[in-house]
Protein backbone atom coordinates (compact mmCIF):
# COMPACT_ATOMS: atom_id res chain seq x y z
CA UNK A 1 0.00 0.00 0.00
CA UNK A 2 1.01 3.57 -0.59
CA UNK A 3 2.64 4.97 2.55
CA UNK A 4 2.60 8.73 2.99
CA UNK A 5 5.95 10.24 3.89
CA UNK A 6 6.14 12.70 6.74
CA UNK A 7 8.53 14.76 4.75
CA UNK A 8 7.36 18.22 3.70
CA UNK A 9 6.08 21.63 4.81
CA UNK A 10 9.12 22.30 6.93
CA UNK A 11 8.83 19.08 8.90
CA UNK A 12 11.18 16.23 8.11
CA UNK A 13 11.15 12.89 9.85
CA UNK A 14 13.69 10.08 9.95
CA UNK A 15 12.39 6.54 10.48
CA UNK A 16 14.87 4.63 12.59
CA UNK A 17 14.35 0.87 12.76
CA UNK A 18 15.36 -0.39 16.19
CA UNK A 19 15.81 -4.06 15.51
CA UNK A 20 16.48 -6.69 18.12
CA UNK A 21 18.59 -8.55 15.59
CA UNK A 22 21.58 -6.44 14.84
CA UNK A 23 25.05 -6.66 13.31
CA UNK A 24 26.53 -5.76 16.69
CA UNK A 25 25.06 -6.53 20.09
CA UNK A 26 24.53 -2.91 20.97
CA UNK A 27 21.93 -1.74 23.50
CA UNK A 28 19.26 0.15 21.57
CA UNK A 29 19.54 2.97 24.11
CA UNK A 30 23.08 3.71 22.87
CA UNK A 31 21.88 3.85 19.28
CA UNK A 32 19.09 6.21 20.33
CA UNK A 33 21.68 8.43 21.99
CA UNK A 34 23.74 8.43 18.81
CA UNK A 35 20.71 9.34 16.70
CA UNK A 36 19.71 12.12 19.09
CA UNK A 37 23.21 13.53 19.13
CA UNK A 38 23.14 13.51 15.34
CA UNK A 39 19.80 15.30 15.31
CA UNK A 40 21.18 18.09 17.50
CA UNK A 41 24.06 18.61 15.07
CA UNK A 42 21.78 18.55 12.01
CA UNK A 43 19.41 21.09 13.54
CA UNK A 44 22.36 23.36 14.28
CA UNK A 45 23.73 23.04 10.76
CA UNK A 46 20.37 23.72 9.13
CA UNK A 47 19.81 26.73 11.37
CA UNK A 48 23.25 28.10 10.50
CA UNK A 49 22.30 27.78 6.84
CA UNK A 50 19.20 29.86 7.48
CA UNK A 51 16.86 26.93 7.00
CA UNK A 52 14.08 27.13 9.58
CA UNK A 53 12.79 23.56 9.52
CA UNK A 54 12.01 20.78 11.96
CA UNK A 55 13.93 17.49 11.88
CA UNK A 56 12.90 14.59 14.11
CA UNK A 57 13.39 10.86 14.38
CA UNK A 58 10.76 8.21 14.96
CA UNK A 59 12.12 5.03 16.53
CA UNK A 60 10.33 1.92 15.30
CA UNK A 61 10.73 -1.05 17.65
CA UNK A 62 9.79 -4.62 16.84
CA UNK A 63 7.93 -6.57 19.51
CA UNK A 64 11.01 -8.68 20.21
CA UNK A 65 8.93 -11.75 21.10
CA UNK A 66 9.29 -13.60 17.86
CA UNK A 67 12.65 -12.34 16.68
CA UNK A 68 14.83 -12.60 19.73
CA UNK A 69 17.96 -14.40 18.66
CA UNK A 70 19.82 -11.11 19.01
CA UNK A 71 22.06 -11.85 16.07
CA UNK A 72 21.21 -11.64 12.39
CA UNK A 73 19.80 -15.10 11.83
CA UNK A 74 16.14 -14.14 12.16
CA UNK A 75 16.53 -10.60 10.95
CA UNK A 76 14.93 -11.18 7.55
CA UNK A 77 11.44 -11.49 8.98
CA UNK A 78 11.98 -8.83 11.63
CA UNK A 79 12.85 -6.26 8.97
CA UNK A 80 9.78 -7.07 6.94
CA UNK A 81 7.60 -7.02 10.06
CA UNK A 82 8.83 -3.53 10.84
CA UNK A 83 8.09 -2.41 7.30
CA UNK A 84 4.60 -3.85 7.67
CA UNK A 85 4.24 -1.89 10.90
CA UNK A 86 5.20 1.31 9.08
CA UNK A 87 2.79 0.46 6.29
CA UNK A 88 -0.06 -0.19 8.71
CA UNK A 89 0.60 3.05 10.51
CA UNK A 90 0.65 4.79 7.12
CA UNK A 91 3.64 6.76 8.34
CA UNK A 92 7.09 6.83 6.88
CA UNK A 93 9.88 9.34 7.24
CA UNK A 94 11.98 10.86 4.46
CA UNK A 95 14.64 8.24 5.02
CA UNK A 96 14.91 4.82 6.60
CA UNK A 97 17.84 4.25 8.91
CA UNK A 98 18.04 0.83 10.29
CA UNK A 99 18.69 -2.65 9.11
CA UNK A 100 22.29 -3.61 9.78
CA UNK A 101 21.96 -7.31 9.00
CA UNK A 102 22.68 -8.32 5.42
CA UNK A 103 19.72 -10.73 5.37
CA UNK A 104 17.19 -8.13 6.46
CA UNK A 105 18.53 -5.34 4.26
CA UNK A 106 18.57 -7.55 1.20
CA UNK A 107 15.02 -8.76 1.78
CA UNK A 108 13.63 -5.33 2.63
CA UNK A 109 15.22 -3.87 -0.46
CA UNK A 110 13.79 -6.68 -2.56
CA UNK A 111 10.29 -6.58 -1.12
CA UNK A 112 9.60 -2.87 -1.22
CA UNK A 113 9.34 -0.32 -3.94
CA UNK A 114 11.92 1.94 -2.42
CA UNK A 115 11.22 5.51 -3.36
CA UNK A 116 13.05 6.61 -0.24
CA UNK A 117 16.68 6.25 0.76
CA UNK A 118 17.82 3.49 3.09
CA UNK A 119 20.89 4.04 5.28
CA UNK A 120 22.54 1.06 6.91
CA UNK A 121 25.19 0.64 9.59
CA UNK A 122 26.25 -2.76 8.33
CA UNK A 123 24.75 -4.86 5.53
CA UNK A 124 28.28 -6.06 4.80
CA UNK A 125 27.50 -8.83 2.30
CA UNK A 126 28.04 -8.82 -1.45
CA UNK A 127 24.29 -9.28 -1.94
CA UNK A 128 23.84 -5.67 -0.76
CA UNK A 129 26.28 -4.29 -3.34
CA UNK A 130 25.12 -1.93 -6.08
CA UNK A 131 21.70 -1.13 -4.60
CA UNK A 132 20.45 2.15 -6.00
CA UNK A 133 18.87 3.60 -2.88
CA UNK A 134 20.95 1.89 -0.21
CA UNK A 135 23.81 3.63 1.55
CA UNK A 136 26.21 1.66 3.77
CA UNK A 137 28.24 3.49 6.39
CA UNK A 138 30.49 0.65 7.52
CA UNK A 139 33.03 -0.92 5.16
CA UNK A 140 31.31 -3.61 3.09
CA UNK A 141 32.94 -6.87 2.01
CA UNK A 142 33.60 -5.57 -1.49
CA UNK A 143 36.05 -2.99 -0.14
CA UNK A 144 37.93 -5.65 1.82
CA UNK A 145 38.14 -7.85 -1.27
CA UNK A 146 39.60 -5.07 -3.36
CA UNK A 147 42.26 -4.38 -0.76
CA UNK A 148 43.25 -8.04 -0.52
CA UNK A 149 43.55 -8.47 -4.28
CA UNK A 150 45.57 -5.27 -4.52
CA UNK A 151 47.89 -6.38 -1.72
CA UNK A 152 48.24 -9.92 -3.08
CA UNK A 153 49.35 -8.55 -6.45
CA UNK A 154 51.81 -6.03 -5.03
CA UNK A 155 55.45 -7.00 -5.52
CA UNK A 156 57.28 -3.69 -5.80
CA UNK A 157 57.66 -2.73 -2.16
CA UNK A 158 60.88 -3.10 -0.18
CA UNK A 159 59.11 -5.52 2.17
CA UNK A 160 56.98 -7.34 -0.42
CA UNK A 161 58.85 -8.43 -3.51
CA UNK A 162 56.60 -11.36 -4.46
CA UNK A 163 53.10 -11.17 -5.81
CA UNK A 164 50.82 -13.76 -4.24
CA UNK A 165 48.16 -15.86 -5.90
CA UNK A 166 47.14 -18.31 -3.18
CA UNK A 167 45.49 -18.29 0.22
CA UNK A 168 43.78 -20.29 2.90
CA UNK A 169 40.68 -18.75 4.47
CA UNK A 170 39.71 -19.80 8.00
CA UNK A 171 35.94 -19.72 8.50
CA UNK A 172 34.37 -21.84 11.20
CA UNK A 173 30.86 -20.39 11.28
CA UNK A 174 31.05 -18.74 14.71
CA UNK A 175 32.06 -15.34 13.32
CA UNK A 176 30.51 -12.00 14.14
CA UNK A 177 28.19 -10.52 11.50
CA UNK A 178 30.88 -8.39 9.84
CA UNK A 179 33.38 -11.25 9.76
CA UNK A 180 30.77 -13.69 8.51
CA UNK A 181 30.11 -11.62 5.40
CA UNK A 182 33.75 -10.67 4.85
CA UNK A 183 34.77 -14.32 4.83
CA UNK A 184 31.67 -15.29 2.88
CA UNK A 185 32.80 -12.91 0.12
CA UNK A 186 36.26 -14.44 0.07
CA UNK A 187 34.79 -17.93 -0.04
CA UNK A 188 32.30 -17.23 -2.85
CA UNK A 189 33.55 -18.87 -6.02
CA UNK A 190 32.21 -16.07 -8.21
CA UNK A 191 33.76 -13.24 -6.22
CA UNK A 192 36.56 -10.95 -7.43
CA UNK A 193 38.91 -12.41 -4.82
CA UNK A 194 38.34 -16.00 -5.99
CA UNK A 195 38.60 -14.94 -9.59
CA UNK A 196 42.00 -13.33 -9.07
CA UNK A 197 43.55 -16.15 -7.00
CA UNK A 198 44.98 -19.33 -8.45
CA UNK A 199 44.42 -21.35 -5.28
CA UNK A 200 42.09 -20.81 -2.34
CA UNK A 201 40.89 -23.30 0.23
CA UNK A 202 38.53 -22.66 3.14
CA UNK A 203 39.54 -24.21 6.47
CA UNK A 204 36.45 -24.91 8.57
CA UNK A 205 37.84 -26.87 11.50
CA UNK A 206 40.22 -25.64 14.20
CA UNK A 207 42.36 -28.71 13.60
CA UNK A 208 42.65 -27.96 9.89
CA UNK A 209 43.97 -24.51 10.71
CA UNK A 210 46.35 -25.84 13.34
CA UNK A 211 47.71 -28.52 11.03
CA UNK A 212 48.45 -26.06 8.23
CA UNK A 213 50.74 -24.02 10.49
CA UNK A 214 53.48 -26.68 10.29
CA UNK A 215 52.40 -28.71 7.25
CA UNK A 216 55.34 -29.05 4.85
CA UNK A 217 52.93 -29.87 2.04
CA UNK A 218 50.74 -26.81 2.48
CA UNK A 219 49.65 -25.14 -0.75
CA UNK A 220 49.92 -21.59 0.57
CA UNK A 221 51.82 -19.72 3.27
CA UNK A 222 49.03 -17.19 3.68
CA UNK A 223 45.99 -17.61 5.91
CA UNK A 224 43.20 -15.04 6.14
CA UNK A 225 41.01 -14.96 9.20
CA UNK A 226 38.70 -12.44 10.83
CA UNK A 227 38.45 -11.40 14.48
CA UNK A 228 40.59 -10.01 17.27
CA UNK A 229 43.90 -11.17 18.73
CA UNK A 230 42.10 -13.16 21.45
CA UNK A 231 40.18 -15.07 18.79
CA UNK A 232 43.47 -15.97 17.12
CA UNK A 233 45.03 -17.02 20.40
CA UNK A 234 42.15 -19.36 21.21
CA UNK A 235 42.75 -21.05 17.89
CA UNK A 236 46.51 -20.97 17.63
CA UNK A 237 47.64 -20.84 21.24
CA UNK A 238 51.40 -21.09 21.58
CA UNK A 239 51.77 -23.63 18.79
CA UNK A 240 54.90 -23.45 16.64
CA UNK A 241 54.39 -21.79 13.29
CA UNK A 242 56.52 -22.33 10.16
CA UNK A 243 58.73 -19.31 9.56
CA UNK A 244 57.16 -18.39 6.22
CA UNK A 245 53.53 -18.46 7.36
CA UNK A 246 51.72 -15.11 7.17
CA UNK A 247 48.38 -14.75 8.94
CA UNK A 248 46.22 -11.83 7.80
CA UNK A 249 43.88 -10.95 10.65
CA UNK A 250 40.95 -8.83 9.49
CA UNK A 251 39.80 -6.73 12.45
CA UNK A 252 38.44 -3.58 10.86
CA UNK A 253 36.38 -2.10 13.67
CA UNK A 254 38.89 -2.20 16.49
CA UNK A 255 40.89 0.81 17.63
CA UNK A 256 42.83 -0.99 20.38
CA UNK A 257 45.94 -1.44 18.23
CA UNK A 258 46.51 2.30 18.23
CA UNK A 259 46.33 2.82 21.98
CA UNK A 260 49.61 3.99 23.50
CA UNK A 261 50.09 1.32 26.10
CA UNK A 262 49.25 -1.67 23.89
CA UNK A 263 51.96 -4.29 23.51
CA UNK A 264 51.56 -7.01 20.91
CA UNK A 265 51.56 -10.50 22.40
CA UNK A 266 54.17 -12.93 21.11
CA UNK A 267 51.64 -14.99 19.16
CA UNK A 268 51.00 -11.94 16.90
CA UNK A 269 54.50 -11.88 15.43
CA UNK A 270 53.51 -13.82 12.27
CA UNK A 271 50.37 -11.74 11.87
CA UNK A 272 49.47 -8.73 9.76
CA UNK A 273 46.39 -6.99 11.14
CA UNK A 274 44.04 -5.21 8.77
CA UNK A 275 42.07 -2.52 10.54
CA UNK A 276 40.60 0.90 9.84
CA UNK A 277 42.48 4.09 10.46
CA UNK A 278 41.21 5.43 13.77
CA UNK A 279 39.29 8.67 13.59
CA UNK A 280 39.82 11.56 15.94
CA UNK A 281 39.02 10.47 19.47
CA UNK A 282 35.34 9.90 20.08
CA UNK A 283 35.90 9.14 23.74
CA UNK A 284 34.61 12.48 24.96
CA UNK A 285 31.31 12.38 23.16
CA UNK A 286 28.28 11.58 25.25
CA UNK A 287 27.08 8.73 23.06
CA UNK A 288 30.38 6.85 22.93
CA UNK A 289 31.70 7.14 26.45
CA UNK A 290 30.44 3.70 27.45
CA UNK A 291 31.14 1.93 24.20
CA UNK A 292 33.79 -0.62 23.31
CA UNK A 293 36.01 0.26 20.32
CA UNK A 294 33.96 -1.93 17.98
CA UNK A 295 30.66 -0.57 19.13
CA UNK A 296 31.91 2.97 18.73
CA UNK A 297 32.08 2.36 14.98
CA UNK A 298 28.55 0.96 14.94
CA UNK A 299 27.03 3.80 16.94
CA UNK A 300 29.07 6.30 14.93
CA UNK A 301 27.59 4.90 11.72
CA UNK A 302 24.09 5.60 13.08
CA UNK A 303 25.12 9.12 14.01
CA UNK A 304 26.73 9.69 10.62
CA UNK A 305 23.57 8.39 8.97
CA UNK A 306 21.68 11.25 10.58
CA UNK A 307 24.35 13.74 9.51
CA UNK A 308 24.22 12.39 5.96
CA UNK A 309 20.47 12.91 5.86
CA UNK A 310 20.97 16.45 7.18
CA UNK A 311 23.57 17.09 4.50
CA UNK A 312 21.26 15.96 1.70
CA UNK A 313 18.24 17.73 3.16
CA UNK A 314 20.21 20.99 3.28
CA UNK A 315 21.31 20.64 -0.36
CA UNK A 316 17.79 19.88 -1.62
CA UNK A 317 16.14 22.63 0.41
CA UNK A 318 18.71 25.19 -0.70
CA UNK A 319 18.05 24.20 -4.31
CA UNK A 320 14.29 24.35 -3.76
CA UNK A 321 13.90 20.69 -4.65
CA UNK A 322 11.32 18.19 -3.47
CA UNK A 323 12.44 15.62 -0.87
CA UNK A 324 9.88 12.93 -1.66
CA UNK A 325 11.20 12.19 -5.12
CA UNK A 326 13.25 9.39 -6.68
CA UNK A 327 15.97 11.98 -7.24
CA UNK A 328 16.36 12.43 -3.49
CA UNK A 329 16.24 8.68 -2.90
CA UNK A 330 19.07 8.15 -5.39
CA UNK A 331 21.22 11.07 -4.25
CA UNK A 332 22.93 9.47 -1.25
CA UNK A 333 26.11 8.49 -3.11
CA UNK A 334 29.18 9.86 -4.85
CA UNK A 335 29.65 12.60 -2.30
CA UNK A 336 31.60 13.72 0.75
CA UNK A 337 29.83 15.09 3.81
CA UNK A 338 30.97 16.36 7.17
CA UNK A 339 30.65 13.40 9.52
CA UNK A 340 30.87 13.49 13.30
CA UNK A 341 34.54 12.64 13.14
CA UNK A 342 35.61 14.42 9.95
CA UNK A 343 34.75 14.10 6.26
CA UNK A 344 32.98 10.92 5.15
CA UNK A 345 33.15 9.88 1.49
CA UNK A 346 30.61 7.67 -0.22
CA UNK A 347 31.43 5.97 -3.51
CA UNK A 348 29.28 5.81 -6.64
CA UNK A 349 27.18 3.07 -5.05
CA UNK A 350 26.64 4.73 -1.70
CA UNK A 351 29.25 2.71 0.18
CA UNK A 352 31.53 4.40 2.65
CA UNK A 353 35.16 4.78 1.67
CA UNK A 354 37.89 4.65 4.25
CA UNK A 355 41.58 4.26 4.90
CA UNK A 356 42.49 0.69 5.74
CA UNK A 357 45.68 0.16 7.69
CA UNK A 358 47.87 -2.94 7.63
CA UNK A 359 49.80 -3.38 10.86
CA UNK A 360 52.69 -5.63 11.78
CA UNK A 361 54.33 -6.47 15.09
CA UNK A 362 57.79 -4.98 15.44
CA UNK A 363 60.19 -7.63 16.73
CA UNK A 364 62.21 -4.80 18.31
CA UNK A 365 59.54 -2.92 20.21
CA UNK A 366 56.72 -5.52 20.42
CA UNK A 367 54.41 -2.72 19.31
CA UNK A 368 51.96 -2.67 16.43
CA UNK A 369 53.36 -0.53 13.62
CA UNK A 370 51.77 0.70 10.41
CA UNK A 371 53.16 -1.13 7.41
CA UNK A 372 51.00 0.49 4.77
CA UNK A 373 47.70 2.24 4.27
CA UNK A 374 45.12 1.67 1.55
CA UNK A 375 42.61 4.21 0.31
CA UNK A 376 39.46 2.36 -0.73
CA UNK A 377 38.25 5.38 -2.71
CA UNK A 378 41.08 5.25 -5.23
CA UNK A 379 42.05 1.58 -4.69
CA UNK A 380 45.64 2.59 -3.91
CA UNK A 381 48.25 1.37 -1.46
CA UNK A 382 50.64 3.74 0.28
CA UNK A 383 53.70 2.12 1.88
CA UNK A 384 54.48 3.67 5.27
CA UNK A 385 57.30 1.68 6.83
CA UNK A 386 59.97 1.14 4.21
CA UNK A 387 62.10 -1.12 6.42
CA UNK A 388 59.82 -2.95 8.83
CA UNK A 389 61.34 -5.01 11.63
CA UNK A 390 59.48 -8.19 10.67
CA UNK A 391 59.82 -11.63 12.14
CA UNK A 392 60.10 -12.97 8.57
CA UNK A 393 63.45 -13.70 6.96
CA UNK A 394 65.36 -10.65 5.65
CA UNK A 395 62.52 -8.50 7.02
CA UNK A 396 60.54 -9.24 3.87
CA UNK A 397 57.21 -10.96 3.47
CA UNK A 398 57.79 -14.49 2.18
CA UNK A 399 56.51 -15.91 -1.06
CA UNK A 400 53.03 -17.37 -0.77
CA UNK A 401 54.29 -20.73 -2.04
CA UNK A 402 57.29 -22.25 -0.33
CA UNK A 403 60.22 -22.92 -2.61
CA UNK A 404 59.02 -20.74 -5.46
CA UNK A 405 61.71 -18.24 -6.44
CA UNK A 406 61.31 -14.64 -7.54
CA UNK A 407 58.77 -13.97 -10.27
Amino acid sequence: SQVSQNCHNGSYEISVLMMGNSAFAEPLKNLEDAVNEGLEIVRGRLQNAGLNVTVNATFMYSDGLIHNSGDCRSSTCEGLDLLRKISNAQRMGCVLIGPSCTYSTFQMYLDTELSYPMISAGSFGLSCDYKETLTRLMSPARKLMYFLVNFWKTNDLPFKTYSWSTSYVYKNGTETEDCFWYLNALEASVSYFSHELGFKVVLRQDKEFQDILMDHNRKSNVIIMCGGPEFLYKLKGDRAVAEDIVIILVDLFNDQYFEDNVTAPDYMKNVLVLTLSPGNSLLNSSFSRNLSPTKRDFALAYLNGILLFGHMLKIFLENGENITTPKFAHAFRNLTFEGYDGPVTLDDWGDVDSTMVLLYTSVDTKKYKVLLTYDTHVNKTYPVDMSPTFTWKNSKLPNDITGRGPQ
Epitope: N150, K153, N155, D156, T161, T381, P383, V384, D385, S387
Partner: antibody, heavy 120, light 112 residues
Framework: EVQLVQSGAEVKRPGSSVKVSCKAS????????MHWVRQAPGQGLEWMGI????????SYAQKFQGRVTMTRDTSTSTVYMELSSLRSEDTAVYYC?????????????WGQGTTVTVSS | DIVMTQSPLSLPVTLGQPASISCRSS???????????LNWFQQRPGQSPRRLIY???NRDSGVPDRFSGSGSGTDFTLKISRVEAEDVGIYYC?????????FGGGTKVEIK
Protein backbone atom coordinates in the same frame (compact mmCIF):
# COMPACT_ATOMS: atom_id res chain seq x y z
CA GLU B 1 55.94 25.13 -7.99
CA VAL B 2 57.79 22.10 -6.62
CA GLN B 3 61.42 22.83 -5.81
CA LEU B 4 64.18 20.65 -4.38
CA VAL B 5 67.21 22.70 -3.39
CA GLN B 6 70.36 20.79 -2.46
CA SER B 7 73.39 21.82 -0.45
CA GLY B 8 76.64 22.91 -2.11
CA ALA B 9 79.58 20.92 -3.46
CA GLU B 10 81.80 19.01 -1.01
CA VAL B 11 85.38 17.79 -1.13
CA LYS B 12 86.12 14.93 1.25
CA ARG B 13 89.00 12.69 2.28
CA PRO B 14 88.75 8.91 1.85
CA GLY B 15 87.33 7.26 4.98
CA SER B 16 85.35 10.33 6.02
CA SER B 17 81.60 11.01 5.74
CA VAL B 18 79.52 13.47 3.79
CA LYS B 19 76.02 14.72 4.54
CA VAL B 20 74.01 16.22 1.69
CA SER B 21 70.77 18.11 2.34
CA CYS B 22 67.72 18.60 0.14
CA LYS B 23 65.14 21.23 1.06
CA ALA B 24 61.68 20.73 -0.41
CA SER B 25 59.11 23.43 -1.10
CA UNK B 26 55.98 23.96 -3.17
CA UNK B 27 54.16 20.86 -1.92
CA UNK B 28 53.19 19.05 1.27
CA UNK B 29 56.48 17.58 2.45
CA UNK B 30 54.99 14.24 3.50
CA UNK B 31 53.12 13.64 0.24
CA UNK B 32 56.17 12.53 -1.77
CA UNK B 33 58.72 9.84 -1.08
CA MET B 34 62.30 11.03 -1.52
CA HIS B 35 64.76 8.99 -3.57
CA TRP B 36 68.52 9.52 -3.74
CA VAL B 37 70.25 8.82 -7.03
CA ARG B 38 73.90 9.33 -7.86
CA GLN B 39 75.88 9.76 -11.05
CA ALA B 40 79.62 9.16 -11.18
CA PRO B 41 81.58 11.19 -13.79
CA GLY B 42 80.77 9.93 -17.27
CA GLN B 43 78.54 7.19 -15.82
CA GLY B 44 74.83 6.48 -15.67
CA LEU B 45 72.27 6.99 -12.89
CA GLU B 46 72.45 4.72 -9.85
CA TRP B 47 69.54 4.43 -7.41
CA MET B 48 70.73 4.55 -3.77
CA GLY B 49 67.63 4.39 -1.62
CA ILE B 50 64.41 6.00 -0.50
CA UNK B 51 62.97 7.69 2.58
CA UNK B 52 59.33 8.20 3.50
CA UNK B 53 59.23 11.72 4.98
CA UNK B 54 55.95 10.88 6.70
CA UNK B 55 57.51 8.53 9.24
CA UNK B 56 61.18 8.69 8.38
CA UNK B 57 61.48 5.02 7.42
CA UNK B 58 64.03 4.11 4.78
CA SER B 59 65.05 1.42 2.33
CA TYR B 60 68.51 1.30 0.78
CA ALA B 61 69.99 -0.40 -2.27
CA GLN B 62 71.98 -3.49 -1.29
CA LYS B 63 75.21 -1.89 -2.49
CA PHE B 64 74.96 0.99 0.00
CA GLN B 65 73.56 -0.94 2.96
CA GLY B 66 75.54 -0.11 6.11
CA ARG B 67 77.16 2.98 4.59
CA VAL B 68 74.23 5.23 3.80
CA THR B 69 71.79 6.89 6.20
CA MET B 70 68.79 8.91 5.08
CA THR B 71 66.98 11.15 7.54
CA ARG B 72 64.49 13.97 7.43
CA ASP B 73 63.49 17.04 9.43
CA THR B 74 59.80 17.77 8.96
CA SER B 75 60.06 21.17 10.68
CA THR B 76 62.28 22.43 7.84
CA SER B 77 60.99 20.10 5.09
CA THR B 78 64.52 18.86 4.56
CA VAL B 79 65.85 15.41 3.73
CA TYR B 80 69.45 14.38 4.38
CA MET B 81 71.65 11.69 2.89
CA GLU B 82 74.82 10.73 4.74
CA LEU B 83 77.40 8.45 3.15
CA SER B 84 80.21 7.16 5.34
CA SER B 85 83.56 5.41 4.77
CA LEU B 86 84.01 7.38 1.56
CA ARG B 87 86.26 6.08 -1.19
CA SER B 88 87.30 7.57 -4.50
CA GLU B 89 84.58 5.64 -6.34
CA ASP B 90 82.01 7.68 -4.40
CA THR B 91 83.00 10.77 -6.34
CA ALA B 92 79.73 11.66 -8.04
CA VAL B 93 76.84 14.06 -8.36
CA TYR B 94 74.16 13.14 -5.78
CA TYR B 95 70.54 13.94 -6.58
CA CYS B 96 67.50 13.95 -4.37
CA UNK B 97 64.33 13.18 -6.32
CA UNK B 98 60.71 13.30 -5.16
CA UNK B 99 58.21 10.71 -6.33
CA UNK B 100 55.00 8.94 -5.52
CA UNK B 101 53.92 5.33 -5.27
CA UNK B 102 50.89 4.12 -7.12
CA UNK B 103 51.41 0.43 -7.86
CA UNK B 104 54.74 1.44 -9.31
CA UNK B 105 57.26 4.03 -8.20
CA UNK B 106 57.66 7.32 -10.00
CA UNK B 107 60.32 10.01 -9.84
CA UNK B 108 58.58 13.28 -10.63
CA UNK B 109 60.97 16.03 -9.52
CA TRP B 110 64.76 16.27 -9.20
CA GLY B 111 67.07 18.46 -7.15
CA GLN B 112 69.87 20.34 -8.91
CA GLY B 113 72.47 17.85 -7.68
CA THR B 114 75.38 18.08 -5.24
CA THR B 115 78.89 17.29 -6.42
CA VAL B 116 80.89 15.23 -3.92
CA THR B 117 84.58 14.77 -4.65
CA VAL B 118 86.52 12.19 -2.66
CA SER B 119 90.23 12.78 -2.91
CA SER B 120 93.33 12.45 -0.75
CA ASP C 1 67.12 -7.09 -9.51
CA ILE C 2 65.85 -6.37 -13.01
CA VAL C 3 68.67 -5.37 -15.37
CA MET C 4 67.94 -2.63 -17.92
CA THR C 5 70.05 -2.60 -21.08
CA GLN C 6 70.03 0.36 -23.44
CA SER C 7 71.30 0.60 -27.00
CA PRO C 8 73.04 2.21 -28.69
CA LEU C 9 75.47 3.72 -26.21
CA SER C 10 75.89 6.73 -28.45
CA LEU C 11 73.58 8.02 -31.16
CA PRO C 12 74.83 10.69 -33.57
CA VAL C 13 71.88 12.25 -35.43
CA THR C 14 71.25 14.94 -38.00
CA LEU C 15 69.02 17.86 -36.99
CA GLY C 16 65.47 17.33 -38.22
CA GLN C 17 65.99 13.59 -38.60
CA PRO C 18 64.34 10.91 -36.43
CA ALA C 19 66.12 9.07 -33.62
CA SER C 20 65.28 5.85 -31.85
CA ILE C 21 66.61 4.49 -28.56
CA SER C 22 66.06 0.92 -27.40
CA CYS C 23 65.70 -0.35 -23.85
CA ARG C 24 65.49 -4.01 -22.93
CA SER C 25 64.66 -5.44 -19.50
CA SER C 26 65.84 -8.78 -18.11
CA UNK C 27 62.24 -9.71 -17.30
CA UNK C 28 58.77 -8.56 -18.26
CA UNK C 29 57.78 -5.17 -16.87
CA UNK C 30 54.07 -5.93 -16.96
CA UNK C 31 52.84 -5.47 -13.41
CA UNK C 32 50.07 -7.52 -11.85
CA UNK C 33 47.64 -4.62 -12.32
CA UNK C 34 48.14 -4.85 -16.09
CA UNK C 35 50.21 -1.66 -16.35
CA UNK C 36 53.80 -1.58 -17.56
CA UNK C 37 56.03 0.58 -15.42
CA LEU C 38 58.71 1.86 -17.77
CA ASN C 39 59.88 5.51 -17.61
CA TRP C 40 62.18 7.57 -19.83
CA PHE C 41 64.34 10.42 -18.51
CA GLN C 42 66.29 13.09 -20.36
CA GLN C 43 69.46 14.67 -18.97
CA ARG C 44 70.73 17.66 -20.85
CA PRO C 45 74.44 18.56 -20.44
CA GLY C 46 75.08 20.05 -17.00
CA GLN C 47 71.45 19.63 -15.89
CA SER C 48 69.45 17.32 -13.65
CA PRO C 49 67.42 14.55 -15.26
CA ARG C 50 63.73 15.13 -16.01
CA ARG C 51 61.08 12.62 -16.81
CA LEU C 52 59.72 12.57 -20.36
CA ILE C 53 57.58 9.42 -20.45
CA TYR C 54 55.90 7.24 -17.81
CA UNK C 55 54.13 3.89 -18.15
CA UNK C 56 55.73 3.25 -21.55
CA UNK C 57 53.92 5.85 -23.62
CA ASN C 58 52.45 8.63 -21.46
CA ARG C 59 54.13 11.99 -22.04
CA ASP C 60 54.72 14.28 -19.06
CA SER C 61 53.25 17.79 -19.28
CA GLY C 62 55.47 20.19 -21.13
CA VAL C 63 57.19 17.44 -23.11
CA PRO C 64 57.08 18.14 -26.88
CA ASP C 65 55.00 15.69 -28.89
CA ARG C 66 58.01 14.77 -31.03
CA PHE C 67 58.89 12.43 -28.15
CA SER C 68 56.99 9.16 -28.05
CA GLY C 69 57.39 5.92 -26.15
CA SER C 70 56.31 2.45 -27.21
CA GLY C 71 56.92 -1.21 -26.49
CA SER C 72 55.68 -4.00 -24.28
CA GLY C 73 56.91 -6.87 -22.13
CA THR C 74 60.70 -6.55 -22.22
CA ASP C 75 61.33 -4.37 -25.29
CA PHE C 76 60.80 -0.62 -25.31
CA THR C 77 61.63 2.28 -27.59
CA LEU C 78 61.89 6.04 -27.22
CA LYS C 79 61.48 7.88 -30.52
CA ILE C 80 62.24 11.48 -31.39
CA SER C 81 60.42 12.24 -34.64
CA ARG C 82 62.61 15.22 -35.64
CA VAL C 83 65.67 15.91 -33.51
CA GLU C 84 66.23 19.50 -32.42
CA ALA C 85 69.37 21.03 -30.93
CA GLU C 86 67.85 21.11 -27.45
CA ASP C 87 67.40 17.33 -27.51
CA VAL C 88 71.12 16.73 -27.09
CA GLY C 89 71.89 14.85 -23.88
CA ILE C 90 71.69 11.44 -22.28
CA TYR C 91 68.47 9.44 -22.18
CA TYR C 92 67.79 6.83 -19.50
CA CYS C 93 65.08 4.22 -19.16
CA UNK C 94 64.01 3.17 -15.67
CA UNK C 95 61.65 0.45 -14.53
CA UNK C 96 59.54 0.61 -11.40
CA UNK C 97 57.81 -2.73 -11.77
CA UNK C 98 59.29 -4.32 -8.70
CA UNK C 99 61.67 -3.54 -5.90
CA UNK C 100 64.18 -1.99 -6.32
CA UNK C 101 63.76 0.35 -9.31
CA UNK C 102 66.75 0.34 -11.68
CA PHE C 103 68.05 2.53 -14.52
CA GLY C 104 69.45 1.64 -17.90
CA GLY C 105 73.04 2.65 -18.68
CA GLY C 106 71.99 5.61 -20.82
CA THR C 107 72.16 6.60 -24.48
CA LYS C 108 74.00 9.75 -25.52
CA VAL C 109 72.28 11.68 -28.29
CA GLU C 110 74.58 14.11 -30.14
CA ILE C 111 74.37 16.12 -33.33
CA LYS C 112 76.40 14.87 -36.30
Amino acid sequence: EVQLVQSGAEVKRPGSSVKVSCKASGYTFTSYYMHWVRQAPGQGLEWMGIINPSGGSTSYAQKFQGRVTMTRDTSTSTVYMELSSLRSEDTAVYYCAAGTYSSGWTIDYWGQGTTVTVSS
Amino acid sequence: DIVMTQSPLSLPVTLGQPASISCRSSQSLVYTDGNTYLNWFQQRPGQSPRRLIYKVSNRDSGVPDRFSGSGSGTDFTLKISRVEAEDVGIYYCMHSKQWPPTFGGGTKVEIK
